[in-house]
Interface confidence: medium
């Protein structure tokens, strides 16, 4: 028998720092969690003891922190060729910068393969990208050879920026031949390490005959057995054991997410390349766990030109820019309608003519505006102030929903109006009107979204029955604020961008902002 | 091998703008930070500014930062710094420099162009 | 912003001697075990050229006759068995916060 160690991280988001025990801003450093410092000393520790080791990522590396905003996918390439990762899997937020901020920093100065099976480039970019990322990759391990075959999610063009020369195939499809491939080169030890979330995981490990292990991310599934060690719930037991078509059991394994855990997988596989046996946990990187010192001093240094970027003006406001929580917690805010605006222009995809737009719903909880932006400061608007108003660190990620399920979330946005609290909801791509003498839960008389299958967009009356698009933040889809019916009965969960990078981007492309209170929620006669 | 080419050497009438450029080769030139700096005759060596062509984020020195822009071309791996409201005693050497904090120089400037030098005269 | 202060501003050696520069910073540039002070060679109409980085690293290319030294607020750069072709002007800079500065410089002459 031959033992193989996996090592593995994904949507890492550009929390190269040490975070808080949420992933947010790391405060307390006491306890602090993750990080590339401590990520390495733990990878190293294990190097030093275990003989056949492999560090993977499975994509999503991008995104995430001013890290990213300032360095564009160059710090995730000297920092991972830093640790010595053996490969990588593109995650749909590598295309965040277009196909050239994947090429430029990251492809191009990678020291280690960067896979996916079922991306395929056409046209004048074939030429230009080839080689610079791979359908798989054979890999010398100890005296052994494993097999790399990497995946990303076919969803991407909605959520990213691919452009349209790369082609995303079904995964299942495109995964299948290069498996193939690697038995007739002898290669019988087969990792798939892919972007596309635990249930296409699950598939793959059932249907690509020939692959033996499937390491994932996407959908920042935790999976724990025993005890879990901090606040993540467990999905189920890790590792997740799929029971193929062939008859085989393929280990499924995932590490949440933001670097706070390295997954941990032991592997022992027969002399045909069977899997015998398969165990381990993800080894949470908490602060007993010293930092590299080496590579701490790495992460000093470049953090000294990060915090400068900060001051610096990103664009200017001409109105003031209304983000008090006696405004956005009780009525339409120009800080809501600016954020909401800014978060459809993000996700602007033209990927089919019968569309305008793949999305044109924004959703935002009021309590989570918690700055106004005075626009007699010289109009300056900077990461800084930004970071006033959304200071929480979070994303602006994308669902799907029943007409109903945003129903009853509008009707929850008021259902104890007048307190203060956080769960008014400002909009974007939506009217509403509301009747306050109404009891709760019947409040909502009026509720008219933007259509996408148009090519002049106007508003209709939401269909109960209809599967819809919403931007909204991370918080809202995980059910914060009381929207539990988000959580429970959303159809689809893509998780987006950093909120700030996602206004700063927007203010950046405006240069002069004036966002105004234009009647997207309204009070009918009498009642308000 | 890693070079940094700057334009020749300009003259101008105080109140007048210049443009000068810095154009790079032998390495990524999206993955480096580019500075600027000024030594006027027979004096030191003055920090004016930087550009991370990457994502076109500045830094300017407080001094400078009313007059001076930096920009940078990545389609053609060249770097800017533009000049306004001149003076006389803004006749100096202007340099670029490559930093080098994305490996062990820690924003040392490892790589220098020969100089441009600025000579603003009535 | 940090101020860098070199002395001497002058210094006249005959070859083979021994040539030290310090620097001195109006503020701690050191941190992590790391110190983010660089060395710079200037001879008359050329570009400065990297000798040394945080403090004591030479710089590949660079004899080892240069070597570097210090760690919080002062710093040393020290030229064993100087030779003529040393003769040049040598300049401090720091890289630990924005603005980044450089010292006023220290020129040495070979007799």
């Known amino acids: 028998a031959w033992e193989l160690t996996i090592l593995h991280t994904n949507d890492v988001h550009s929390r190269l720092e040490q975070t808080s025990e949420d992933s947010s801003k790391c405060v307390n450093a006491s306890r602090c969690m993750g990080g590339v410092a401590r990520l390495f000393t733990k990878v190293q520790q294990i190097r030093r003891a275990e003989p056949n080791v492999l560090l993977l990522d499975a994509g999503d590396q991008y995104q995430g922190t001013i890290w990213f905003t300032v360095y564009k996918g160059a710090e995730v390439a000297h920092f991972m060729n830093a640790l010595r990762y053996d490969a990588m899997a593109l995650g749909n937020h590598e295309f965040d910068n277009g196909v050239e901020g994947l090429i430029e920093p990251l492809l191009k100065e990678a020291k280690f393969p960067i896979l996916s099976a079922n991306i395929k480039a056409k046209g004048p970019l074939a030429s230009q990208i080839s080689g610079l990322y791979l359908p798989y990759k054979v890999l010398p391990v100890g005296d052994e050879v494993v097999g790399i075959v990497g995946y990303t999610s076919k969803e991407t063009p909605f959520l990213s920026n691919p452009g349209t020369n790369l082609v995303f195939e079904d995964e299942i499809t495109a995964l299948q031949p290069e498996v193939d491939k690697l038995k007739t080169l002898n290669v019988n030890k087969i990792i798939a390490l892919g972007h596309s979330g635990f249930e296409m995981d699950k598939l793959i490990a059932q249907k690509v005959r020939g692959v033996d292990v499937v390491v994932g991310g996407h959908s920042n599934t935790f999976l724990y057995t025993g005890n879990p060690p901090s606040k993540e719930v467990p999905a189920g037991k890790y590792p997740f054991i799929v029971t193929s078509d062939d008859g085989r059991k393929v280990p499924v394994v995932q590490a949440y997410a933001f670097g706070k855990y390295l997954g941990y997988l032991k592997i022992e596989f027969d002399e045909r390349g069977n899997v015998i046996s398969s165990h381990g946990n993800p080894i949470l990187l908490n602060s007993s766990i010293p930092e590299d010192p080496s590579i701490k001093a790495d992460i000093n240094k470049w953090r000294i030109k990060l915090d400068n970027y900060s001051t610096q003006e990103l664009g200017k406001t001409i109105v003031y820019l209304d983000g008090s929580s006696q405004s956005c917690r009780f009525r339409e805010c120009n800080m809501g309608n600016l954020i909401c605006d800014a978060m459809i222009n993000n996700n602007l995809r033209h990927t089919d003519e019968m569309f305008w737009n793949h999305v044109s719903m924004c959703i935002l909880n009021g309590g989570g505006i918690r700055s106004p932006i005075d626009e007699r400061n010289n109009g300056t608007i900077t990461w800084e102030n930004l970071a006033a108003v959304l200071p929480f660190g979070g994303t602006f990620d994308l669902v799907q929903l029943k007409g109903s399920t945003l129903k009853k979330a509008f009707e929850h946005s008021v259902h104890r109006y007048g307190q203060s609290t956080g769960e008014f909801l400002q909009v974007g791509g939506i009217h509403v009107v509301y009747d306050l003498s109404r009891k709760p839960g019947d409040r909502v008389v009026k509720l008219d979204v933007l259509c996408t299958k148009c090519r002049v967009p106007s508003y209709d009356p939401l269909k109960m029955d209809e599967v819809y698009k919403v931007i909204l933040p991370n918080f809202l889809a995980n059910g914060g604020d009381g929207f539990q019916m988000i959580k429970d009965e959303l159809l689809r969960h893509d998780s987006g961008d950093q909120d700030i990078n996602v206004v700063s981007t927007y203010i950046s492309k405006m240069k002069v902002i004036y966002p105004a209170v234009e009647g997207r929620i309204k009070f009918s006669t009498g009642s308000h | 091998e890693v070079q940094l080419v700057q334009s020749g050497a300009e003259v101008k009438k105080p109140g007048a703008t210049v443009k000068i450029s810095c154009k790079v080769s032998g390495y990524t030139f999206t993955s480096y930070w580019i500075t600027w700096i000024r030594q006027p005759p027979g004096k030191g060596l003055e920090w004016i500014g930087d550009?991370?062509?990457?994502?076109?984020?500045?830094n300017y020195n407080e001094k400078f930062k009313t007059r001076v822009t930096i920009s940078a071309d990545k389609s053609i791996s060249t770097a800017y710094l533009q000049w306004s409201s001149l003076k006389a005693s803004d006749t100096a050497m202007y340099y670029c420099a490559k930093e080098g904090g994305l490996t062990t120089e820690d924003y040392a400037l490892d790589y220098w162009g020969q100089g441009t030098l600025v000579t603003v005269s009535s | 912003e940090i101020v860098l202060t070199q002395s001497p501003d002058f210094q006249s050696v005959t070859p083979k001697e021994k040539v030290t520069i310090t620097c001195r910073a109006s503020k701690n540039v050191s941190t992590s075990g790391y110190s983010y002070m660089h060395w710079y060679q200037q001879k008359p109409g050329k570009a400065p050229k990297l000798l040394i980085y945080?403090?004591?690293n030479l710089e590949s290319g660079i004899p080892p006759r240069f070597s570097g030294s210090g760690y919080g607020t002062d710093f040393t750069l020290t030229i064993n068995n100087i030779e003529s072709e040393d003769a040049a002007y040598y300049f401090c800079q720091h890289s630990r916060e924005l603005p980044f500065t450089f010292g006023q410089g220290t020129k040495v002459e070979i007799k």
């Open positions: 550009i991370y062509p990457g994502s076109g984020n500045t």
């Open positions: 945080l403090a004591s």
